[in-house]
């Protein structure tokens, strides 16, 4: 039973492998990998590429097996697959492996890029699209504008990027974006470098992110990892802090006034 012999394609259909609370987590979080077979199984195996023997076994007479990874470290990140088998199959015969699940354990997601399409110079009456591009799919992207405390726009994207459209008349300004996991426990990216959008005839000016007034690096996620992403008004702002935010719509937010802070 140690070395699985994989049967011919589609002989025993593959199971599904998922992660709770998420596939991208910070170190120290408890992660459960759940392998679900399309039929009741008898034994489940969790595999990592390059390893002949399963990393973990679960003998469960059910369609579901859970593998617990306690207080994960970055070293436990990587690619996982699972298989299942039944006692009435031949010795060592396992199902097709699940699709890969990539577990990423990191304190911070890589910095996204922010570019203007077609370019950072806006002609009269023309709109401009800002693309915030990270490296991971299914993330929530947030666009900020210097001088506006609330996020300018918010997008959840299945792609590793999100496009934000700015109306020409209101486009000129200094922008920054970041992205984060769509649900708790939140993992935030570094903030992009700022992008200056200017009118035709004024040269765009590149500035390093650190010098952008009124914009700070992302702050920590909310203290309760089980909570939904809060709105900015539900915690104390420190200058402008980039936080995971729950959008009012899936597409975008209108600019909002800065949150009131009665405790100040």
């Amino acid at each position: 039973d140690i070395t699985p012999s994989v049967p011919p394609a589609s002989y025993h259909p593959k199971p599904w492998l998922g992660a709770q609370p998420a596939t991208v987590v910070t170190p120290g979080v408890n992660v459960t990998l759940r392998c679900r077979a399309p039929q009741p199984a008898w034994r489940f195996g969790l595999f990592k590429p390059g390893e002949i023997a399963p990393l973990l076994f679960r003998d469960v007479s059910s369609e579901l097996a859970e593998f617990f990874l306690e207080e994960v470290t970055p070293a436990q990140g990587g690619i996982y697959r699972c298989c299942y088998r039944r006692p009435d199959w031949g010795p060592g015969v396992w199902s097709q492996p699940s699709d890969v699940l990539e577990l990423l354990v990191t304190e911070e997601l890589p910095r996204p890029s922010l570019v203007a399409l077609p370019g950072p110079v806006v002609g009269p009456g023309a709109n401009v699209s800002l693309r915030c591009a990270g490296r991971l799919r299914n993330m929530s992207f947030v666009l900020y504008r210097e001088g506006v405390a609330a996020p300018l726009q918010y997008r959840h994207s299945a792609q590793p990027w999100a496009d934000f459209t700015l109306l020409g008349a209101r486009a000129p300004g200094t922008y920054s974006c970041y992205y984060h996991t769509p649900s708790a426990p939140y993992v935030l990216s570094q903030r992009s470098e700022v992008l200056v959008i200017s009118w035709e005839g004024e040269g765009p000016e590149a500035r390093p992110a650190s010098s952008a007034p009124g914009m700070q690096a992302p702050g920590p996620p909310p203290s309760d990892p089980g909570a939904q992403a809060p709105s900015l008004s539900s915690f104390r702002p420190r200058g402008l802090v980039l936080q995971p935010l729950l959008p009012q719509t899936q597409d975008s937010w209108d600019p909002a006034p800065p949150p009131s802070d009665p405790g100040v």
Partner: antibody, heavy 121, light 106 residues
């Protein structure tokens, strides 16, 4: 959209055999188990067995072994159930149903309209 | 085999009333599924994986439970909810259904 279209009502003599069909459309037939469920008039639901059309693998309720035989024809995306040595106890409505087979869903997500079978001399 | 026992077998409720029906399994199951069936029709997937409402169905329905004890709840009964509800497990062969709860409108 996903559809399971079952064959029409059957009338059969005791001791005879009958073959019911379930034609699938709107999805890849070989990706999901097809289940068969029996319901006698005014009674509950009883699982007969399932077939994985991708391989032809079958799993039966012990109660129906020898009574039901499940097959599938990939070329026509049709699942079949043959019932043999019929008795009045086999008079019922027979449903085919697709297993959802998703990480986040494991019920029978689509059902055929049912085939009534009457066994009578 | 896992025996699923539904209770009550028959019940009636007035419009607006809260309705709770239960399904007890003889052994632990990972998930419970629920179907609604009306006379002359196929069963309809109603709640899957214990607590997920199938798309297009009213939010007044909810499901909960774990292990051997599961429930289907209607927060406010409506006339169209009158039907028979079956619980169902796929955690162990043979797959089994409960005997059904017939819900009538008062």
């Amino acid at each position: 959209q996903v559809q399971l279209q079952q064959s029409g009502a059957e009338l059969a003599r005791p001791g005879a055999s009958v073959k019911l069909s379930c034609k699938a459309s709107g999805y890849t037939f070989t990706d999901n188990y097809i289940n068969w469920v029996k319901q006698r008039t005014g009674q509950g639901l009883e699982w007969i067995g399932e077939i994985y059309p991708g391989s032809g693998n079958t799993y039966y309720n012990e109660k129906f072994k020898g009574k039901a035989t499940l097959t599938a024809d990939k070329s026509s995306s049709t699942a079949y159930m043959q019932l043999s040595s019929l008795t009045s106890e086999d008079s019922a409505v027979y449903f085919c149903a697709r297993s959802a087979n998703r990480y986040d869903r494991g019920d029978f997500d689509y059902w055929g309209q049912g085939t009534p079978l009457t066994v009578s001399s | 085999q896992i025996l699923l026992t539904q209770s009550p077998a028959i019940m009636s409720a007035s419009p607006g009333e809260k309705v709770t029906m239960t399904c007890s399994a003889s052994s632990s199951v990972s998930y419970m599924h629920w179907y609604q069936q009306k006379p002359g029709s196929s069963p309809k997937p109603w709640i899957y994986d214990t607590s997920n409402l199938a798309s297009g169905f009213p939010a007044r329905f909810s499901g909960s439970g774990s292990g051997t004890s599961y429930s289907l709840i209607i927060s406010s009964m409506e006339a169209e909810d009158a039907a028979t509800y079956y619980c169902h497990q796929r955690s162990s062969y043979p797959y089994t259904f409960g005997g059904g709860t017939k819900l009538e409108i008062k």
